[in-house]
């Protein structure tokens, strides 16, 4: 028998520095977690103690903090090289800055293979990107070889900016021939490493003949056997065992997100490459694990540029950006309009001739807006200003909801109107009229939404049974501010970009902004 240790991360999302337990900015260092310096300590400890170790990443290193905003992926290549990753799969967020934003900082700089079998380049891009990412890689590990085959969510064109010269194929269809090829090369230990979410990970384990282990990402799935060490609730045991269609027991793993855990899986193979046993657990990277001093020093060196960036001008406003609680928790506010416009703009994807865009709607809890920006400061807007407006370090996510769920959400928005509570919704691509003289739960008298399947966008009444795409803060997707109906009834949820980054990118793009209050939210006569 031959034993392999798989160490794995996924959805790190730019958490190079240690974070608080909830993966936001580290406040009390003695209780902080994760970060590449601490990860390196644990990885090195395992490498010293065990003979056959692979360190793998299942995608979405890009996007999530000011590190990515400033360094645009160069930080990912640098620190993953320093940690000596063995392989990485492409995630959807790796395409956030377009293909060029993937090629230059990461693909050309990485000293480890970057993989995806279901992304096919065409046209002029095919020769430019050739060899920079691979469908699979055979890695020598001790006296043996292990095949790693990559995959990426086929939804990436809707979630990021891969452009028109990359085709995202069905994962299972694309993986099978690559696995077959590895088999003909006498590689009998094969890991599928990819970024399509836990449901797809399980399907790959079930359907792709010859895959021995699946290491996944995208869904931030936490698996654990026994008593979990922090607040994440396990979605199942680690590893999660899937019985394949040809009768094999295939372990599937994922390690939550944000570099909080290091996945640790031990696999025992027989001489024919069959999995005999698999066991392990994610390792919580808490403060009992010291940060490696050399990596930490490097982080501190790279950090300097971030502090300078915070005070640089991103763009200008020629109007007062009203982010006061007096406005945003009671009525339409132009700061809410600005943020929602930025959220929609960040999700412009012309993927189908029938649609001007795949999503037109945004909702945003007024309580999430925490500061105005005064135009009398020469109109200057900085990252620092935006961090005061959006201080909680969230993401703007894409969800799919039925019209009936949206109606409930808008009723919830005003169910206790007048108490300066945070659930009052700011909107984009939506016209809503409330009648506050009616009883709570029956106050939405008009709800029109901007069409997507149209060449000239116009507002149509919301249909209860139709499924709509909506951009919203992850806080709302998770049921925050009492929006339990969103959490309970959402049909799909894909995590998006860092909130401040979305707004800062929009302001930089527009250069000068002047958002207005324009009648997106109205109160019918006699009620307000």
């Amino acid at each position: 028998a031959w034993e392999l240790t798989i160490l794995h991360t996924n959805d790190v999302h730019s958490r190079l520095e240690q974070t608080s337990e909830d993966s936001s900015k580290c406040v009390n260092a003695s209780r902080c977690m994760g970060g590449v310096a601490r990860l390196f300590t644990k990885v090195q400890q395992i490498r010293r103690a065990e003979p056959n170790v692979l360190l793998l990443d299942a995608g979405d290193q890009y996007q999530g903090t000011i590190w990515f905003t400033v360094y645009k992926g160069a930080e990912v290549a640098h620190f993953m090289n320093a940690l000596r990753y063995d392989a990485m799969a492409l995630g959807n967020h790796e395409f956030d800055n377009g293909v060029e934003g993937l090629i230059e900082p990461l693909l050309k700089e990485a000293k480890f293979p970057i993989l995806s079998a279901n992304i096919k380049a065409k046209g002029p891009l095919a020769s430019q990107i050739s060899g920079l990412y691979l469908p699979y890689k055979v890695l020598p590990v001790g006296d043996e070889v292990v095949g790693i085959v990559g995959y990426t969510s086929k939804e990436t064109p809707f979630l990021s900016n891969p452009g028109t010269n990359l085709v995202f194929e069905d994962e299972i269809t694309a993986l099978q021939p690559e696995v077959d090829k590895l088999k003909t090369l006498n590689v009998n230990k094969i890991i599928a490493l990819g970024h399509s979410g836990f449901e797809m990970d399980k399907l790959i384990a079930q359907k792709v003949r010859g895959v021995d282990v699946v290491v996944g990402g995208h869904s931030n799935t936490f698996l654990y056997t026994g008593n979990p060490p922090s607040k994440e609730v396990p979605a199942g045991k680690y590893p999660f065992i899937v019985t394949s269609d040809d009768g094999r027991k295939v372990p599937v793993v994922q390690a939550y997100a944000f570099g909080k855990y290091l996945g640790y899986l031990k696999i025992e193979f027989d001489e024919r490459g069959n999995v005999i046993s698999s066991h392990g657990n994610p390792i919580l990277l808490n403060s009992s694990i010291p940060e490696d001093p050399s990596i930490k020093a490097d982080i501190n060196k790279w950090r300097i540029k971030l502090d300078n960036y915070s005070t640089q001008e991103l763009g200008k406003t020629i109007v007062y950006l009203d982010g006061s609680s007096q406005s945003c928790r009671f009525r339409e506010c132009n700061m809410g309009n600005l943020i929602c416009d930025a959220m929609i703009n960040n999700n412009l994807r012309h993927t189908d001739e029938m649609f001007w865009n795949h999503v037109s709607m945004c909702i945003l809890n007024g309580g999430g807006i925490r500061s105005p920006i005064d135009e009398r400061n020469n109109g200057t807007i900085t990252w620092e200003n935006l961090a005061a407006v959006l201080p909680f370090g969230g993401t703007f996510d894409l969800v799919q909801l039925k019209g009936s769920t949206l109606k409930k959400a808008f009723e919830h928005s005003v169910h206790r109107y007048g108490q300066s509570t945070g659930e009052f919704l700011q909107v984009g691509g939506i016209h809503v009229v409330y009648d506050l003289s009616r009883k709570p739960g029956d106050r939405v008298v008009k709800l029109d939404v901007l069409c997507t399947k149209c060449r000239v966008p116009s507002y149509d009444p919301l249909k209860m049974d139709e499924v709509y795409k909506v951009i919203l803060p992850n806080f709302l997707a998770n049921g925050g501010d009492g929006f339990q109906m969103i959490k309970d009834e959402l049909l799909r949820h894909d995590s998006g970009d860092q909130d401040i980054n979305v707004v800062s990118t929009y302001i930089s793009k527009m250069k000068v902004i002047y958002p207005a209050v324009e009648g997106r939210i109205k109160f019918s006569t006699g009620s307000h």
């Epitope: 009390n28 006061s324 609680s325 105005p372 005061a388 909680f392 300066s420």
Partner: antibody, heavy 116, light 105 residues
């Protein structure tokens, strides 16, 4: 994150007192702030809240018209002006960030004793 | 909105499963939090939004309920869990329950 209350002490019925809460380690100006009190050997009683930008204030019925909450975001400070104090206002007074939410932090409290 | 907690005191042993209930005088959706307080200390948030575990709180604590009836469960009591527990609604101006004192049997 640190919240440090001060200004407590002994005061006669009908008298006044001003409590302060000094905040550090977080973006004070981004958080709604509360005062909560606890009479000796008794349970918790919410007193007042002020929104992050100072534009909204709410009070418990038991203190309405007598207590005033205020803040100075430039100084990272929260205040509670207490007038017309009564014996039943005797309590440990805590300042806290957005209670019952993810960003929930409390100070260690300051004791106010109203007695003749 | 009044909050009624029960029981007002409770004796239990290490390893026991303990349940504390809280009833609101009217529907409060999931606007409910649970706090733990030890003598001479500030309250510590355990659960918010009825069932969401606060950062750093052990997973043996869990919350459930919606509307008017809510429950705090400690799956296996540890020595450090003996304290007073309060529920608190934030649907309207905040209001705390009267507290449940959890003592060693």
């Amino acid at each position: 994150v640190q919240l440090v209350e001060s200004g407590g002490g002994l005061v006669q019925p009908g008298g006044s007192l001003r409590l302060s809460c000094a905040a550090s380690g977080f973006t004070f100006s981004s958080y709604d702030m509360h005062w909560v009190r606890q009479a000796p050997g008794k349970g918790l009683e919410w007193v007042a809240v002020m929104s992050y930008d100072g534009s909204n204030k709410y009070y418990a019925d038991s203190v309405k018209g007598r207590f005033t909450i205020s803040r100075d975001n430039s100084k990272n400070a929260l205040y509670l002006q207490m007038n017309s104090l009564r014996a039943e206002d005797t309590a440990v007074y805590y300042c806290a960030t957005e209670i019952a939410a993810k960003g929930d932090y409390w100070g260690q409290g300051t004791l106010v004793t109203v007695s003749s | 909105i009044q909050m009624t907690q029960s029981p007002s005191s409770l004796s239990a042993s290490v390893g026991d499963r303990v349940t504390i209930t809280c009833r609101a005088s009217q529907g409060i959706s999931n606007y409910l939090a649970w706090y733990q307080q030890k003598p001479g200390k500030a309250p510590k948030l355990l659960i918010y939004a009825a069932s969401t575990l606060q950062s750093g709180v052990p997973s043996r604590f869990s919350g459930s309920g919606s509307g008017t009836d809510f429950t705090l469960t400690i799956s296996s009591l540890q020595p450090e869990d003996f304290a007073t527990y309060y529920c608190q609604q934030s649907y309207s101006t905040p209001h705390f329950g009267q507290g449940t004192r959890l003592e060693i049997k």
